[in-house]
Interface confidence: medium
């Protein structure tokens, strides 16, 4: 028979014959022959291969370097890489999460729209009319101005995006 020019899925062509690829989690030790199947061996500790492959070396699991603020979010297996995330208060600088930076704080006049996660930074928004923030914070939302009316008080000083209103007693009518 004619030697094949293409092979089925999960096979590869070598020496004019189709050999089985190694399954995820295993590396190639030797190609198949007329007599024998492809030889594959499991990846070692801290190694992985995530596809059907003919790799002779497994990939090393990613190292989550604590010196860069990283920690393990999901431990790698023989078929998956380790997933790193950042320590509390920090977030990844890229999708690959190779290093971390401190979460941004929202300045006075701005509140937290979305609290930062291990992979995304704090999202701030300006405090709209009727709300304020007088602190720099990575957690605090804009607070509503105090309602003087509900306390039977009157506004003595108007609020801003950075300060609350100041309430005071109503002026008494003199007889």
């Amino acid at each position: 028979p004619e030697p094949p020019t293409a092979c089925r899925e999960k096979q590869y062509l070598i020496n004019s014959q189709c050999c089985s690829l190694c399954q995820p989690g295993q590396k190639l030790v030797s190609d198949c022959t007329e007599f024998t199947e492809t030889e594959c061996l499991p990846c070692g500790e801290s190694e992985f291969l995530d596809t059907w492959n003919r790799e002779t070396h497994c990939h090393q699991h990613k190292y989550c370097d604590p010196n860069l603020g990283l920690r393990v979010q999901q431990k790698g297996t023989s078929e998956t890489d380790t997933i790193c995330t950042c320590e509390e208060g920090w977030h990844c600088t890229s999708e690959a999460c190779e290093s971390c930076v401190l979460h941004r704080s929202c300045s006075p006049g701005f509140g937290v729209k979305q609290i930062a996660t291990g992979v995304s930074d704090t999202i701030c928004e300006p405090c709209p009319v009727g709300f304020f923030s007088n602190v720099s914070s990575a957690f605090e939302k804009c607070h509503p101005w105090t309602s003087c009316e509900t306390k039977d008080l009157v506004v003595q000083q108007a609020g801003t995006n950075k300060t609350d209103v100041v309430c005071g007693p109503q002026d008494r009518l003199r007889a």
Partner: nanobody
Amino acid sequence: EVQLLESGGGLVQPGGSLRLSCAASGFTFSHYHMGWARQAPGKGLEWVSVIGPRGISTYYADSVKGRFTISRDNSKNTLYLQMNSLRAEDTAVYYCAKSPSRHRFDYWGQGTLVTVSS
């Protein structure tokens, strides 16, 4: 220079056992498939058994399946063939071979004679 040196052959009664050895040198043994072939008097070469570099994958001729076991010790650069339940038709010169192929014969030892007779 590649060298393959077989040993362990001899005269054995039908139903008996023998273990052949092949000491290899001159190449990185653990990188190659190895095999045993035999030639009976007045007949052509027949592949008996083949083993992959790590011993994970093996091949046996139908005539020896269940009776012969191929193995290797890469730390000792040695190939083995354990032959059980021997029959008269197993009488042959047994050759150790590197990189076995049905279509070519790379490197061979000088052979060891196995005679099965009562």
